[in-house]
């Protein structure tokens, strides 16, 4: 069996986790991708997923999770903004490839979020303010994209998550430290 490896990220509350999961371009560019949390003794739980087929560089936001799939680079960018201590845990990017098992993109991410100074605006005169502007989307994110006769022939489809945003943009004002994972070494 393949030894599952983990990459550890230690961040403060309010910061942003910014992970890039790379994949084989030709094989998986338009496949649906998901961000999952894995807890001890439990099956992976899907927290957010891209559309089907996955659209190029089209951000999908579910709560504080933002997914962007860059087909031209073969990478899925996952951001978890305004981190909370309870976000600590083990995460993974996966690609849905029914009828086969979801394909896991190495490595798993061990996120440790601690309380303390996070460099939020106003807490330090040198701190900067990042504002993410994400265009609204009214698309429905379907996870998983395992199609069954019912999901193909009936509308609305099963298990849909409305990922539309209430305003024309999302302002994330207390994000300062963006942690980036190098993908192209």
């Amino acid at each position: 069996a393949t030894k599952l490896t983990e990459e550890k990220y230690e961040l403060k509350e309010g910061q942003t986790l910014d992970v890039k999961c790379d994949y084989t371009l030709e094989k998986f560019a338009s496949s649906q991708k998901a961000w999952q949390i894995i807890r001890d003794g439990e099956m992976p739980k899907t927290l957010a997923c891209t559309e089907r087929p996955s659209k190029n560089s089209h951000p999908v936001q579910v709560g504080r999770i933002i997914l962007e799939d860059y087909h031209d680079h073969g990478l899925l960018r996952v951001r978890m903004v305004n981190l909370q201590v309870e976000d600590s845990g083990l995460y993974q990017c996966v690609i849905y490839q029914p009828p086969k098992e979801p394909h896991m993109l190495f490595d798993r991410i061990r996120l440790v979020v601690t309380k303390g100074f996070s460099g939020t605006p106003g807490s330090n005169e040198n701190s900067t303010q990042n504002v993410y502007k994400i265009p609204p989307t009214t698309t429905k994110a379907l996870c998983p994209l395992y199609t069954s006769p019912r999901t193909v022939t009936q509308a609305p489809p099963k298990s849909t998550a409305d990922v539309s945003t209430p305003d024309s943009e999302i302002n994330l004002t207390n994000v300062t430290d963006i942690i980036r994972v190098p993908v192209f070494n």
Partner: antibody, heavy 119, light 113 residues
Framework: QVQLVQSGAEVKKPGASVKVSCKAS????????MHWVRQAPGQGLEWMGI????????SYAQKFQGRVTMTRDTSTSTVYMELSSLRSEDTAVYYC????????????WGQGTLVTVSS | DIVMTQSPDSLAVSLGERATINCKSS????????????LAWYQQKPGQPPKLLIY???TRESGVPDRFSGSGSGTDFTLTISSLQAEDVAVYYC?????????FGGGTKVEIK
Amino acid sequence: QVQLVQSGAEVKKPGASVKVSCKASGYTFTSYYMHWVRQAPGQGLEWMGIINPSGGSTSYAQKFQGRVTMTRDTSTSTVYMELSSLRSEDTAVYYCARGLIYGDAFDYWGQGTLVTVSS
Amino acid sequence: DIVMTQSPDSLAVSLGERATINCKSSQSVLFSSNNKNYLAWYQQKPGQPPKLLIYWASTRESGVPDRFSGSGSGTDFTLTISSLQAEDVAVYYCQQLASYPYTFGGGTKVEIK
């Protein structure tokens, strides 16, 4: 359409084991988790555990740990739940239920299998 | 384990009237990262398996009449039947799907007054 068809009713003696089957059809079997839930006569619902038909991995409720075994046969799209060391309190209707992977709720259920444990 | 407490145990409502069932969890079932409450509601009629009505606390399952609605967040949830129909007579269960073991409320029996 999606269907989960379970095996027939069983009568067992205390201390024996029972194996209930659940045959899935109408969807890609390996793409959804399967759960087992039981319901004693006139009582509520109790979650027993989960199996991932794709890899076969399982997780059981602590209460049933050591007594329950969930397996699957991908060639027949069937999951099995075996409960050993039966006692009278295990008399119940046992259901298999398909779990949504995004949302996790149980969207399709088998018709149920009544297991009666009596001496 | 997360304990789910439903109230009332039973409820008698006139046809066309509103029925409200409450469910309280001993711990929050909200995942703040994706802002989803891992709470589902099921309907069970005698001799039948449960039927999924609502998941994520407020997302109606396809094919479920819109008189059924779910609300709430964190630890307190409500299932509302806006205008009770004869076919709604059943036992209703809430279930948390936030962590194993997935647990159900004790059920609420809805009858016609």
